[in-house]
Structure formats: C-alpha cells, structure tokens
C-alpha cells in the first residue's frame, strides 16, 4: 500500500491545506490526510494511540475499497472476515469460520461439510467405485495347478475417494473359494514350487462351481518337514503317470 501523509500549516478557515504531499488532496497537521487524490483510498492508520489519515492505492487486509463520487475509502470487512470483495461478500474467513457463498459461518449448512484445509464449506463427496473386474484364475498359494480347492479374487478401482462426511468405500477386493478338476503341474511349475504329496483321485466333473470342502488341500510349496527322499520321489512319479489319464485340466 502506498501511503501519503500531509504535513502542512493549518489555514484559518477550513483548517485544511490543499498543498499536501503524495496522495493527499487535503490535509492538516494534526490529522494527516483529510481527503485523497482521485482513485486513492482514504484509511486510518494507527500510530501509537493516534489514528492518522493516509491515502492508499489499495486497501489493507481486512478492508475493501468503497468508491463514491470523488470520495473513496477503505471500509472494514465484517468482524468474522479476513478479506472481502465488499461488505456482503467475504473471500477468506477469520480462523474458526468456514466460507460459504461469501459468508463466514461457525458451522456448515446441511448437506455440506467443513474443509479444514481451505476453511470452506464444500459438498459432501461419496465414494464411487468401478464395476468388478473378472475373477482371477483359481489358485492356491500362487499356483494354478496341483490342487483341488483354492481361491479366486476379483478387484475394482476407487473412482472417487469420499470426503470426511461422505459414504465410506465398499470393499475393493473379494475372495471366494473355488474348486477345480486337478491338473498336473508342468515341469517348470514343479521345479519352482516342488512336488505335492500323494492325493486322492478327484471325482470326475468337479469344477469351480462345486461347493468347496471345509478342509482345503495343502499346497505344493515345500517346508522342511515335507521334504522327501529321492526314492519316494521316483515312486510318486510312476503314480502320477498313472493318475494323469483320468485328470481333465481346467484353465
């Protein structure tokens, strides 16, 4: 803000001088600026216990410029308002108040919520999610072979995160048990995951739609207690060859 203070001898009649410094149009020794040059705003500036008239090119924070014919001044925003466009339209509220349609409110109206970052009343935003993606393949401990019962998963994305008062997001992933007609693991899979223990032959026609047993089949992933010696492995290879005739693969 550009301030100008007049300092001139008082005249006997209107106690006013028109030969003032800077932005003052009329001034006095005691009061500083009394009126301002065109387009400047009159404001009172506190100096200690005294208020002195100054002429500003723009109004300070907490004030807005009012213009009347040949007389402009800085006018205070409302008590709860920090910056305003005019007396009835606040653009930033004081601490503890929320801005809504140019007004400063203690609490936001129904259907709106307080944004404590912007200190504004904003619309409540509810969570939005996409459609479910397709179910994943039926797996057990990351494998899609060598088991009867496993789990399959599907996911969906959050399109719109909710605001503080918005409806929470529903689950974005779902898992369910699934049943497959067991397929033999290929060499690459076996190498990675190890061998499964000897299992009972599955019934023909079992599929994902079948209701899974409460007991889930063990995975092929080895743990120390499950290690087999070479002789047992050879024995199982022969058994697997025999079984594979009756196993239909489900992808």
């Amino acid at each position: 803000q550009n301030a100008s203070r007049g300092r001139r001898q008082r005249r006997m009649h209107p106690n006013v001088s028109q030969g003032c410094q800077g932005g003052c149009a009329t001034c006095s020794d005691y009061n500083g600026c009394l009126s301002c040059k065109p387009r400047l705003f009159f404001a009172l500036e506190r100096i200690g216990m005294k208020q002195i008239g100054v002429c500003l090119s723009s109004c300070p924070s907490g004030y807005y410029g009012t213009r009347y014919p040949d007389i402009n001044k800085c006018t205070k925003c409302k008590a709860d308002c920090d910056t305003c466009f005019n007396k009835n339209f606040c653009t930033k509220c004081k601490s503890g108040f929320y801005l809504h349609l140019g007004k400063c409110l203690d609490n936001c109206p129904e259907g709106l919520e307080a944004n404590n970052h912007t200190m504004e009343c904003v619309s409540i935003v509810h969570c939005e999610v996409s459609e479910w993606n397709p179910w994943s393949p039926c797996t057990k401990k990351g494998k899609t072979c060598g088991f009867k019962r496993g789990t399959e998963t599907r996911v969906r994305e959050i399109i719109q995160h909710p605001s503080a008062k918005g409806n929470l997001c529903p689950p974005t992933n779902e898992t369910r048990k699934c049943t497959v007609q067991r397929k033999k693991c290929q060499k690459g899979e076996r190498g990675k995951k190890g061998r499964e223990r000897k299992r009972k032959k599955p019934n023909k026609g079992e599929s994902k739609e079948a209701i899974p047993d409460s007991k889930s089949l063990e995975s092929s992933k080895e743990i120390p207690e499950q290690r087999e010696n070479k002789q047992q492995q050879k024995k199982r290879k022969v058994q697997d060859k025999q079984k594979s005739v009756s196993v239909s693969t489900v992808h």
Epitope: P14, T26, S35, L44, G53, T75, K76, A79
Partner: antibody
C-alpha cells in the same frame, strides 16, 4: 470563516418542485463536499446528498429519484431540487460541508430555511 | 443502510452532573462517527468527529469513545449551556445516517 446561507421559497404546493440554493463564502465549492440535510419539525436529521468539488453528486437512495443537486461555480453556489413534494417534505433544510474522511464532518452549516409544503 | 440507535431519547440532569449518551450502529462503523449539539431554532454544531476528536473551540468536558458498533458521548460536568439535543452521525458509508437524538433537559 466559511459561511453557508440557504435561500429559496418558504412555501411550496404539493406535487411541485422545491428549489433551494446555498451560497458559500470563505471557501470555494471546487474543494470539499457540499451537502443538503433536512429536519422535519420536532424530528431528527436526514442526509439528502452531496455535490463534490468536481461537480459529481450522490443522493440518499431513499430520495434519489426526486433529488437533483447542481452547482454554479461562478457564483460559488450549489442547489437542491426536490420534485413531487408532499407534506412529508416539510422541514428545515440545511446546507453543510465537509472536507474528507479525516476531518470534521459537517464542520460548517447554514442557518437553515424552513420549507412548508401546503396548498 | 446502517441504522443508528441512540439512547436514551431524553434525560434530565442537573448542572455538574456527568452525562453519558450512547449510539449503537447496526454494523461495525470503524470509528467513523461524529456527535452534534443542536439548540432550538439553530443549526447543529459539530462537537466530535472520528469517535473521539474534539472540534476546535469545543470545551474539553465533551469527550467521545467507542469502537465497532458502540459509541459514547460523555459530558463530564454538565453546564447550563449544554442543555440541548445531541445527535450521532455515522459516515462509514453512504447514505449517512443520524441517530434519533437525545434531549438533555434540566432536572
């Protein structure tokens, strides 16, 4: 010393136009703000409007449609016209001046002139 | 428009009394307030401007105070010549509005 003197007819008929003049001495009307204020008998003060040092005017919105404020700088006078008067416009009319927000408002007043609206 | 509510509307006091007149604005007027004294058949006379500044020649028994919406004129020791009607005026914005007046009468 700044002096202001109001003049004009003391009686105006209803629906006619009230016309008053304020003659200023001791200062030029090309500085400051020159106002009209009225006071109905036994009542309070009402601000009517002003004409500025440059000749721009501002009127009280409650009277605006009926008020005209003008000036004659050669005579150092400013005038008030109030149209379509009724008995409610009966009042003492004052002219007064101020020099800006930082100084006394209405530091100088005319003596006032009573205008009666009656047929 | 800003409304100015002045109180009391009248009061009776004796010479030497301390008298207080108040004016309440309908909104914050930021110290842009003047006080006037008017005697019957005379034009008003400005006593105080910008809330507390005394006009040259006005006795120091008159003082003004206040801020925001509430303002006070105090006559510390009432003198015979002070019996009159007193008005407040806000000039924070246009249109300017006066209080309804307070008549100070002799008790």
């Amino acid at each position: 010393e700044v002096q202001l003197v109001e003049s004009g007819p003391g009686l105006v008929k209803p629906s006619e136009t009230l016309s008053l003049t304020c003659t200023v001495s001791g200062d030029s009307i090309t500085s400051g703000y020159w106002n009209w204020i009225r006071q109905p008998p036994g009542k309070g003060l009402e601000w009517i409007g002003y004409i500025s040092y440059s000749g721009k005017t501002y009127q009280n919105p409650s009277l605006k449609s009926r008020v005209t404020i003008s000036r004659d700088t050669s005579k150092n006078q400013f005038s008030l016209k109030l149209s379509s008067v009724t008995a409610a416009d009966t009042a003492v009319y004052y002219c007064a001046t101020y020099y800006g927000y930082g100084g006394p408002w209405f530091a100088y007043w005319g003596q006032g002139t009573l205008v009666t609206v009656s047929s | 428009d800003i409304q100015m509510t002045q109180s009391p509307s009248s009061l009776s006091a004796s010479v030497g009394d301390r008298v207080t007149i108040t004016c309440k604005a309908s909104q914050d007027i930021d110290s842009y307030l003047s006080w006037f004294q008017q005697k019957p058949g005379k034009a008003p006379k400005t006593l105080i401007y910008l809330t507390n500044r005394l006009v040259d020649g006005v006795p120091s028994r008159f003082s003004g105070s206040g801020s925001g919406q509430d303002y006070t004129l105090t006559i510390s020791s009432l003198q015979p010549e002070d019996f009159a009607t007193y008005y407040c005026l806000h000039y924070d914005e246009f249109p300017l509005t006066f209080g309804q007046g307070t008549k100070v009468e002799i008790k």
